[in-house]
Interface confidence: medium
């Protein structure tokens, strides 16, 4: 067979669809691999061919487009299931070719089962809402292209297992779900079930997403360094271990990169010769505010190390802060026996 540009198995597009529901899957070639779209390819005389490999099989098979009621069909660059069956799970390949050109990509399709409370192995998208931030909305995702605009579907929203009706602060508004004032108690999984008619049949689309209530930008502050602080002095003798924790609180900020780092005499620990180790631990509040601790450790500190400047730095999208640790050498207690002996010496 002639050479074909094989993009392999595109595991980045692990497609999951519910059993017994319609699914429309676009050939990833035009979305992620090729510089032209399906219309251009079609105009140039290229043909799109679909085939698949069943789960736990190696054999590539053609897709049966002659099933009753056109259960599986192809329209332009979209493969349609009306509806899916559990044994449709497998790796699907779309190949674009003519006599001189060939390009193909495979992708995994998993048909998953859900229970009556919409629990399933489906990976759920997460939608973040700001706490106590006024009206915010989520929209029923991935339903475009399933029915024409002339069709008016019915949409039912659920929180977990419960139909959303007469909820205090959550109001279904068609494809949107409005949160009048988002609270931590609104965290959870929300499901929209879209029901629409097509050719005398009724289809359901189930879409679940996770709502996560996070800190509001109204309450966001620059990083706060809790430690080191002015009240704690790290007093050590040469040879002892020096441990200085830098503990920083970061308000939640969407897409902000929180950074904590130490400098020793103005340099990063990697850029100096002393034997320093840095260990980090992170915890999050339920609104995804973050507390980050970086512990600077010098196993056997020298008197030179005790004269250095140790500064903890922190940065987020809200700003940058720094705080120096108070480090000093412990003054040895006076050895009274020797001093007294000297004091009473003969003159």
């Amino acid at each position: 067979s002639e050479r074909c540009d094989d993009w392999g198995l595109d595991t980045m597009r692990q497609i999951q669809v519910f059993e017994d529901e319609p699914a429309r899957i676009k050939c990833p070639l035009f979305e992620h691999f090729l510089k032209f779209n399906y219309s251009t390819a079609h105009s140039a005389g290229l043909t799109l061919i679909w085939y698949w490999t069943r789960q736990d099989r190696d054999l590539e098979e053609p897709i049966n487009f002659r099933l009753p009621e056109n259960r599986i069909s192809k329209e332009k660059d979209v493969l349609w299931f009306r509806p899916t069956l559990l044994n449709d799970t497998g790796n699907y390949t779309c190949m674009l070719r003519n006599t001189t050109y060939c390009s193909k990509v495979a992708f995994p399709l998993e048909v998953v089962q859900k229970d009556s409370c919409f629990n399933s192995p489906m990976k759920l998208p997460v939608h973040k809402l700001y706490i106590e931030y006024g009206i915010q909305r989520i929209t029923c995702p991935n339903v475009d292209g399933y029915f024409p605009s002339s069709v008016k579907p019915t949409i039912t929203w659920y929180m977990g297992c419960y139909k959303i009706q007469n909820f205090n602060n959550v109001i279904p508004e068609g494809m949107n779900l409005s949160f009048l004032i988002a609270l931590i108690s609104n965290n959870g999984n929300y499901t929209c079930v879209v029901t629409y008619p097509e050719n005398g049949r009724t289809f359901h689309l189930t879409r679940t997403l996770t709502v996560k209530v996070v800190g509001s930008p109204k309450n966001a502050v620059p990083p706060v360094i809790h430690s080191p602080n002015d009240h704690v002095v790290y007093e050590k003798e040469p040879g002892e271990e020096l441990l200085i924790p830098c503990t920083v609180y970061f308000s939640f900020l969407m897409d902000s990169r929180n950074e904590v780092w130490w400098t020793i005499d103005g340099k990063k620990p990697d850029d100096i010769t002393i034997d320093v180790t840095i260990n980090e631990s992170i915890s999050h509040s339920r609104t995804e505010d973050e507390t980050r601790t970086q512990i600077l450790s010098i196993k056997k500190v020298t008197s030179e190390d005790l004269k250095r400047s140790y500064v903890c730095h922190a940065r987020s999208a809200k700003g940058e802060v720094a705080k120096a640790a108070k480090v000093k050498q412990k003054v040895p207690a006076p050895r009274y026996t020797v001093e007294l002996a000297c004091g009473f010496g003969a003159t």
Epitope: S185, S227, S281, I282, S283, T291, T293, I295
Partner: antibody, heavy 120, light 113 residues
Framework: SVEESGGRLVTPGTPLTLTCTVS????????MGWVRQAPGKGLEYIGI??????TYYASWAKGRFTISKTSSTTVDLKITSLTTEDTATYFC?????????????????WGQGTLVTVSS | DIVMTQTPASVSEPVGGTVTIKCQAS??????LAWYQQKPGQPPKLLIY???ALASGVSSRFIGSGYGTEFTLTISGVQSEDAATYYC???????????????FGGGTEVVVK
């Protein structure tokens, strides 16, 4: 808020179930812990139930204490075969401070406690 | 299980003074340590988490420090309302499933003169 109930005077050997009822947040989101305090003594950790339903117990509490989630707003603590040593105020507390592994690291919302007295 | 040893058992300090409470873990807990204040007839109240982070609404007179096995709670400029029993609490075995647990120190009674 967090509220404990079910504490009462019982005789040794009796089983008892305490209930913790929460409002304003969901137990499908938060972990909850049980802590007890004998009269005039310190705090003693019993165990935690995670938001996913996993339970963790203090080694001394394993076997005789069972924590279970009965709804998204209630958690039970079942104690089998009470002894006089179990006389204490039992606190239910929301556990927070989540790390990467979803393990709670402190208790930041406590109930007022419910008193269990075991006496013959 | 980790054992938390809290010292002293009791401390008395005049108004305006400084109180220092120490807590020692039987093995390293990095910074997974919290401090609580408990007044008679009331549940404990979280003061400090992650060794040095101040809980929401808590006065900055409460300072937590330490790492590994040695931790300190310092109350500077002690006020009469600070009279209470203070407990440290550690978390250990994070990420290790069945060995995950919590332990409290024995408590320190603070008397304000």
């Amino acid at each position: 808020s967090v509220e404990e109930s079910g504490g009462r005077l019982v005789t040794p050997g009796t089983p008892l179930t305490l209930t913790c009822t929460v409002s304003g947040f969901s137990l499908n989101v938060y972990n909850m812990g049980w802590v007890r305090q004998a009269p005039g003594k310190g705090l003693e950790y019993i165990g935690i139930i995670s938001s996913s339903g996993t339970t963790y117990y203090a080694s001394w509490a394993k076997g005789r204490f069972t924590i279970s989630k009965t709804s998204s707003t209630t958690v039970d603590l079942k104690i089998t075969s009470l002894t006089t040593e179990d006389t204490a105020t039992y606190f239910c507390a929301r556990a927070d401070g989540y790390t990467e592994g979803d393990y709670a690291t402190y208790f930041n919302l406590w109930g007022q406690g419910t008193l269990v007295t075991v006496s013959s | 299980d980790i054992v938390m040893t809290q010292t002293p058992a009791s401390v008395s300090e005049p108004v305006g003074g400084t109180v220092t409470i120490k807590c020692q873990a039987s093995q390293s807990i990095t910074t997974w340590l919290a401090w609580y204040q408990q007044k008679p007839g009331q549940p404990p109240k979280l003061l400090i988490y992650q060794a040095s982070a101040l809980a929401s609404g808590v006065s900055s007179r409460f300072i937590g420090s330490g790492y590994g096995t040695e931790f300190t709670l310092t109350i500077s400029g002690v006020q009469s309302e600070d009279a209470a029993t203070y407990y440290c609490q550690c978390t250990y075995g994070i990420g290790s499933g069945s060995s995950y647990g919590v332990a409290f120190g024995g408590g320190t009674e603070v008397v304000v003169k």
